[in-house]
């Protein structure tokens, strides 16, 4: 076809951004291109062309009219992880092509099993008590908080400090006795540890 004066090659005007998304949730990788004639858009993951509903109507990925890639649900198994990876969109017309910046799609996860469950502690009143916990593996890395008798502990109380996976209670009182649970949390949700009992005895 002859070059028309007003025609111009593609350029990406909206690049996709890195995203972390939970398994089973929908998400979109944005891409917008300008050019004349209007460029066609294709997506590539880790260098391999991504199939969309344009190739297979049953696909869980849809190429939107804007050029964005919409995932009906993020698919992510124990082994197969077809949606996780590094994506680029490529815009093409007869004058050339433009490639977007890379965008990583990572799948958030939060396992069930705690790396370390807290264990029962027995202390004398007035002594410090330390309960330790390591949350389940997760992405993003889970943060933790603690519950005593199913109620979240306020770590603003001056006798209580939470650092990393350690709950430290200085100058313990009888009222501190009870069942303590460590809670690991990230964008996927929350996981409760096995409970640990703190026993405080009078000397």
């Amino acid at each position: 076809s002859r070059l028309r004066q007003e025609d111009f090659p593609p350029r990406i005007v909206e690049h996709p951004s890195d995203v972390i998304v939970s398994k089973g949730e929908p998400t979109t990788l944005n891409c917008k291109a300008e050019g004349r004639p209007t460029p066609t858009i294709e997506w590539y993951k880790d260098g391999e062309r991504v199939e969309t509903d344009k190739d297979d109507p049953r696909s869980h990925r849809m190429l939107l009219p804007s050029g964005s890639l919409f995932f009906l649900r993020i698919v992510h198994g124990r082994r197969s992880k077809p949606d996780e990876g590094s994506y680029v969109c490529v815009a093409r017309n007869y004058l050339g092509e433009a490639v977007s910046r890379n965008a990583s799609l990572e799948v958030a996860l939060l396992r069930d099993d705690f790396r370390q469950n807290p264990t029962d502690v027995v202390v004398a009143a007035g002594e410090p008590a330390i309960l330790e916990c390591q949350p389940p593996r997760g992405h993003p890395e889970p943060t933790i908080y603690w519950k005593k008798d199913k109620v979240r502990i306020d770590d603003k109380e001056e006798r209580i400090s939470i650092r990393g996976g350690k709950l430290m209670i200085s100058n313990t009182r009888k009222s501190d006795a009870g069942m303590y649970t460590c809670v690991g949390t990230n964008m996927v949700g929350e996981r409760d540890s096995d409970p640990a009992e703190l026993t405080v005895f009078e000397r």
């Epitope: 880790d46 199939e51 198994g77 077809p82 990876g85």
Partner: antibody, heavy 118, light 105 residues
Framework: EVQLVQSGAEVKKPGASVKVSCKAS????????MHWVRQAPGQGLEWMGW????????EFPQKFQGRVTMTRDTSITTAYMDLSRLRSDDTAVYYC???????????WGQGTMVTVSS | DIVMTQSPSSLSASVGDRVTITCRAS??????LNWYQQKPGKAPKLLIY???SLQSGVPSRFSGSGSGTDFTLTISSLQPEDFATYYC???????FGGGTKVEIK
């Protein structure tokens, strides 16, 4: 269309090796683990192992370790299963199967009959 | 290895019957269980994944249930095309059960 197309039937002598191919199309080859499953005549399904096409990592059950090799060529989206030191009880239909993101074998090849006979 | 035990190994039933096949794991596999149907000379076909999720395109008369160690595949009203062999598979270690052949009574 998502499909797996396997190589044709083979007849081998005991002690020989066989290499079966599995050509994938219609999906992102490196995104899904590929498994091999075999079925002896009149018997059930026996899992032989997997390959991760993204990096070539493999895993096999104890029974097949040292005798099976799984490889892939990402440029032609094809997985291979090589079974060595063939015995008569290796006579079976060999299937490749894609593992979905739901941890199940959702797409299967048509099967390759391997006959081991002297 | 986690061993999968299917029962019965075969059964005879009539069109319209409700059919139940069970699968037991030697240790807990949570909901990591799949069911397949295989007809003579054909590759297996996925029916149910994750113990109870129906694979796209599979008729709703097929259903799966269970978690932990005990699982069930149910065909609510057996159709002529359902006479086949059924296999369970655990997707932790990927081993299959021994199969259940559903024959015409």
């Amino acid at each position: 269309e998502v499909q797996l197309v396997q190589s044709g039937a083979e007849v081998k002598k005991p002690g020989a090796s066989v290499k079966v191919s599995c050509k994938a199309s219609g999906y992102t080859f490196t995104g899904y683990y590929m498994h091999w499953v075999r079925q002896a005549p009149g018997q059930g399904l026996e899992w032989m192992g997997w390959i991760n096409p993204k990096n070539g990592d493999t895993e096999f059950p104890q029974k097949f370790q040292g005798r099976v090799t799984m490889t892939r060529d990402t440029s032609i989206t094809t997985a291979y299963m090589d079974l060595s030191r063939l015995r008569s009880d290796d006579t079976a239909v060999y299937y490749c199967a894609r593992e979905s993101g739901d941890d199940a074998f959702d797409i299967w090849g048509q099967g390759t009959m391997v006959t081991v006979s002297s | 290895d986690i061993v999968m035990t299917q029962s019965p190994s075969s059964l005879s039933a009539s069109v319209g019957d409700r059919v139940t096949i069970t699968c037991r794991a030697s240790q807990s596999i949570s909901s990591y269980l799949n069911w397949y149907q295989q007809k003579p000379g054909k590759a297996p076909k996925l029916l149910i994944y994750a113990a109870s999720s129906l694979q796209s395109g599979v008729p709703s008369r097929f259903s799966g249930s269970g978690s932990g160690t005990d699982f069930t595949l149910t065909i609510s009203s057996l159709q002529p095309e359902d006479f086949a062999t059924y296999y369970c598979q655990q997707s932790v270690g990927l081993f299959f059960g021994g199969g259940t052949k559903v024959e015409i009574k």
